[in-house]
Amino acid sequence: PGPPPGPPRVSPDPRAELDSTVLLTRSLLADTRQLAAQLRDKFPADGDHNLDSLPTLAMSAGALGALQLPGVLTRLRADLLSYLRHVQWLRRAGGSSLKTLEPELGTLQARLDRLLRRLQLLMSRLALPQPPPDPPAPPLAPPSSAWGGIRAAHAILGGLHLTLDWAVRGLLLLKTRL
């Protein structure tokens, strides 16, 4: 095998990786909260909005104590992939009224993409199971009207906010177990 190589190149320790993932998730949560508030200011929401294609909320805060690391990361990755797809769809098909949310919506998409990559790297470093992704969902139908696009935006940002809030709590709890 030849001589031993020199000191290997340094990359982040999984615990440091988890720390930076928490920071990134918090930052994304703040972005989402701000964007949701911006949307409410421009287009006040008349009650709660939901979208059947969005993932159901992963877990109540009270159930966090029983979490296992693989389950949290796998579920979080799957849910965030779904939200990424919905944000992409919103930017593409949301209509002219939602153009007022740019460039913030584009920034949100880029940060969501970055968080997903960070989660996957963390799972690889820990050698946690990364199950095959769900089969591709059917394409999302364009909103039926401009107001339909706005309602969808309320639902997507609201759901993402709840998911990220759960994610921060879950990741902080998991940090104590690593």
Epitope: L121, S124, L128, P132
Partner: antibody, heavy 114, light 111 residues
Framework: EVQLLESGGGLVQPGGSLRLSCAAS????????MHWVRQAPGKGLEWVAV????????YYADSVKGRFTISRDNSKNTLYLQMNSLRAEDTAVYYC???????WGQGTLVTVSS | QSVLTQPPSASGTPGQRVTISCSGS?????????VHWYQQLPGTAPKLLIY???ERPSGVPDRFSGSKSGTSASLAISGLRSEDEADYYC???????????FGGGTKLTVL
């Protein structure tokens, strides 16, 4: 400085067994998933097995499933590979690697021949 | 036959820019799984060169860069040097294996 030091390689007859060890230092061993990767003479890299940071998940390449067992002892910072029913095609340099893999040992040669 | 396909060889002259491709499928690289690149100098163990498609571990010169698009990835080496002569491997997570899969490797020759 990160170090991964493999040992236990050598010449073994077909059907025989060997146990490889990998001693880790210079990083938090218990926070990393660990792999065994092999390289047959003049060939490319082939992933063999992986074990999660806490030892609760283990996965194997189809070519070694049922014959090789990966394990770890976090209290000793050591990774193991128990190889049974060895075949000529298992002849390779075996590397232990940590993380993505981010860090690699220098390898230990396993030769299966009669 | 590797699940990830790389050209067996590549070459360039000192100072040149060389690109090595790595082609996968919708079940690995195309399924949001990151690509990592390794350099194996003659007679030594592999070393991580690029992780998460484009991130460089500390100590890796910025002459090395990575990118990913769709189901393929590429490694670019600019300002080629004689010491870059080595085998280069791409790797990605393969969900059917529950482990990483490596490309067949590309032997880079500096002319």
């Amino acid at each position: 400085e990160v170090q991964l030091l493999e040992s236990g390689g050598g010449l073994v007859q077909p059907g025989g067994s060997l146990r490889l060890s990998c001693a880790a230092s210079g990083f938090t061993f218990s926070s990393y998933g660990m792999h065994w990767v092999r390289q047959a003479p003049g060939k490319g890299l082939e992933w063999v097995a992986v074990i999660s940071y806490d030892g609760s998940y283990k996965y194997y390449a189809d070519s070694v499933k049922g014959r090789f067992t990966i394990s770890r002892d976090n209290s000793k910072n050591t990774l193991y590979l128990q190889m049974n029913s060895l075949r000529a095609e298992d002849t390779a340099v075996y590397y232990c690697a940590a993380g993505v893999p981010d860090y690699w040992g220098q390898g230990t040669l396993v030769t299966v021949s009669s | 036959q590797s699940v990830l396909t790389q050209p067996p060889s590549a070459s360039g002259t000192p100072g040149q820019r060389v690109t090595i491709s790595c082609s996968g499928s919708s079940s690995n690289i195309g399924s949001y799984y990151d690509v990592h690149w390794y350099q194996q100098l003659p007679g030594t163990a592999p070393k991580l060169l690029i992780y998460s498609n484009e991130e460089r571990p500390s100590g890796v010169p910025d002459r090395f860069s990575g990118s990913k698009s769709g189901t393929s990835a590429s490694l670019a080496i600019s300002g080629l040097r004689s010491e870059d002569e080595a085998d280069y491997y791409c790797a990605a997570w393969d969900p059917s294996l529950y482990g990483p899969v490596f490309g067949g490797g590309t032997k880079l020759t500096v002319l």
